[in-house]
Interface confidence: low
Amino acid sequence: NKILVKQSPMLVAYDNAVNLSCKYSYNLFSREFRASLHKGLDSAVEVCVVYGNYSQQLQVYSKTGFNCDGKLGNESVTFYLQNLYVNQTDIYFCKIEVMYPPPYLDNEKSNGTIIHVKGKHLCPSPLFPGPSKP
């Protein structure tokens, strides 16, 4: 049994920031779950992770240099991405895994959202050039 995910087909980030809402056919209330956002047709870059545990505060992090925040709804997770670069325009996929209670569940691959970063051309620092194009 797989969780279904709905995403908007295309979002335009005018000021290098965008809210991407991942809507699930599953209620996350009182569940331990890991929601993530992935960049590229091959989902090679894990952009942001929202980890929820009914007994702890929501954890939001990125291990790939993205500036992200996350908000939880009963059947949705919204990722707020900031400081996006124009060359990070790509297709982004929502993923969800429910670890507890059993059984472990994950989602059918969603159809993805094209995020078109249309805002100012931010210049990546030489020390951290930002995630590369796939």
């Epitope: 995403q7 908007s8 087909p9 295309m10 335009v12 159809n111 993805g112 078109h116």
Partner: nanobody
Framework: EVQLVESGGGLVQAGESLRLSCAAS????????MAWYRQAPGSQRELVAA???????YYADSVKGRFTISRDNAKTTVYLQMNSLRPEDTAVYYC???????????WGQGTQVTVSS
């Protein structure tokens, strides 16, 4: 079910032009976004151009100024006018359309574009 019919691919010389078209038919509720991807041999599929229902447009840097995406909402058709073609534009070009209220992407079968030098 939705059908996408792509046409316009072919073999051209560098510097020449081609116009791809993709017509969507079937159980179309509303078309939100229409896009073109391409995949060259041994490469990942790449987003080339996209246009949404209010005609906001995206182009990959590699095609800016050479390719133009447009859509005919009445005919539920998307076009890709490709000018000043280069050998590196050689790829299979896929039409990608979001045609339902469920935010579901449909992919065409692809049309081959070959640019010889």
């Amino acid at each position: 079910e939705v059908q996408l019919v792509e046409s316009g691919g072919g073999l051209v010389q560098a510097g020449e032009s081609l116009r791809l078209s993709c017509a969507a038919s079937g159980s179309i509720a509303s078309i939100k976004t229409m896009a073109w991807y391409r995949q060259a041999p041994g490469s990942q599929r790449e987003l080339v151009a996209a246009i949404n229902y209010i005609k906001e447009i995206y182009y990959a840097d590699s095609v800016k100024g050479r390719f133009t995406i447009s859509r005919d909402n009445a005919k539920t058709t998307v076009y890709l006018q490709m000018n000043s073609l280069r050998p590196e534009d050689t790829a299979v070009y896929y039409c990608v359309v979001d045609v339902t209220k469920e935010d579901y992407w449909y992919w065409g079968q692809g049309t081959q574009v070959t640019v010889s030098s």
